[in-house]
């Protein structure tokens, strides 16, 4: 049953632990069939989600999936919080689950976790050459 509905693949209770001062890319995986939908990011403020205007975003196209990316260059302490992506497609609004960023302020962190430390803590997934990491419950 291959549906042509737009799908946003952000799982419920999705979380990322990141460090202030590092670059970070928040990805919204998008599946669409023909025309790429218009996708936006918003940040939750209580029950309302405030659209993020004037923020750097980009698309990354892969074979069976596309990613609408919100760039943090760099991560700031007040980037802490929950985000949601939304797609407008054929006058339908499709909303993702929220994904939460937990930002650790480097000033308050005693020391950045080393690669060895991360290897011993498998829930911290070290990605690329950046010093950010992900944390999934």
């Amino acid at each position: 049953k291959e549906s042509c509905d737009v799908q946003l693949y952000i799982k419920r209770q999705s979380e990322h632990s990141i460090l202030a001062g590092d670059p970070f890319e928040l990805e919204c995986p998008v599946k669409y069939c023909a025309n790429r939908p218009h996708v936006t990011w918003c940040k939750l403020n209580g029950t309302t989600c405030v659209k993020l205007e004037d923020r750097q975003t980009s698309w990354k196209e892969e074979k069976n999936i596309s990613f609408f990316i919100l760039h943090f260059e760099p991560v700031l302490p007040n980037d802490n919080g929950s985000y949601r992506c939304s797609a407008n497609f054929q006058s339908n609004l499709i909303e993702s689950h929220s994904t939460t960023l937990y930002v650790t302020d480097v000033k308050s962190a005693s020391e950045r976790p080393s690669k060895d430390e991360m290897a011993s803590r498998p829930w911290l997934l070290y990605r690329h050459h950046h010093h950010h990491h992900h944390h999934h419950h």
Partner: antibody, heavy 121, light 112 residues
Framework: QVTLKESGPTLVKPTQTLTLTCTFS??????????VSWIRQPPGKALEWLAH???????RFNPSLKSRLTITKDTSKNQVVLTMTNMDPVDTATYYC?????????????WGQGTLVTVSS | DVVMTQSPLSLPVTLGQPASISCKST???????????LNWFQQRPGQSPRSLIY???KLDSGVPDRFSGSGSGTDFTLKISRVEAEDVGVYYC?????????FGQGTKVEIK
């Protein structure tokens, strides 16, 4: 054509660890949106969701059993393995694996035939 | 945990007549993404469960259109417009909005 099949021991002793394998075909667990859940059904009783593994290896567990459960996937073999420690006679049930498809979130659209596991000394 | 309560637990029906099963949840199943993750499954005697309906009212592939689902919030209904002999079995509702995902206790449909 999507199929799932459970395999494992039919009889385990109390305190032993149960290991069940779900072998599937017709889909890939590396595809975005895909997942596999384990669900059990004691004889003559209702269904109980146990654990789920997503395409990106993220996992969810029923909190009432979380300390006893592990779930892993082998994408190349098209298999998902559930282990349950410290088995007890109350864990006697038919254990099913089901495909988690995605429409905004997971829903179970295909189920295996189930395997009856009896816990007895 | 969200408790799913089905009624009736046993439903004797006449062939060709309609049937209706209720499912109530202890919390609203409307998710923050605007969707309601309420599904219905059929389990025929001696068989595995089979998906009938997802997202309250979407019919799964291969499911006859005599089945329909409706409801919102905490109250949901599965309807069979004209019961056929192959519809005998146990029907379960399931919620996927809150972890842990939970099933109803089942409704046994049998022919009078």
């Amino acid at each position: 054509q999507v199929t799932l099949k459970e395999s494992g021991p039919t009889l385990v002793k109390p305190t032993q660890t149960l290991t069940l394998t779900c072998t599937f075909s017709g889909f890939s667990l590396s595809t975005f949106g895909m997942g596999v859940s384990w669900i059990r059904q004691p004889p003559g009783k209702a269904l109980e969701w146990l654990a789920h593994i997503y395409w990106d290896d993220d996992k969810r567990f029923n909190p009432s059993l979380k300390s006893r459960l592990t779930i892993t996937k082998d994408t190349s073999k098209n298999q998902v393995v559930l282990t349950m420690t410290n088995m007890d006679p109350v864990d006697t049930a038919t254990y099913y694996c089901a495909r988690g498809n995605w429409d905004g979130e997971t829903y179970f659209d295909y189920w295996g035939q189930g395997t009856l596991v009896t816990v007895s000394s | 945990d969200v408790v799913m309560t089905q009624s009736p637990l046993s439903l004797p029906v006449t062939l060709g007549q309609p049937a209706s099963i209720s499912c109530k949840s202890t919390q609203s199943l409307l998710d923050s993404d605007g969707k309601t993750y309420l599904n219905w499954f059929q389990q025929r005697p001696g068989q595995s469960p089979r998906s009938l309906i997802y997202l309250v009212s979407k019919l799964d592939s291969g499911v006859p259109d005599r089945f329909s689902g409706s409801g919102s919030g905490t109250d949901f209904t599965l309807k069979i417009s004209r019961v056929e002999a192959e519809d005998v079995g146990v029907y379960y509702c399931w919620q996927g909005t809150h972890f842990p995902w939970t099933f109803g206790q089942g409704t046994k449909v049998e022919i009078k």
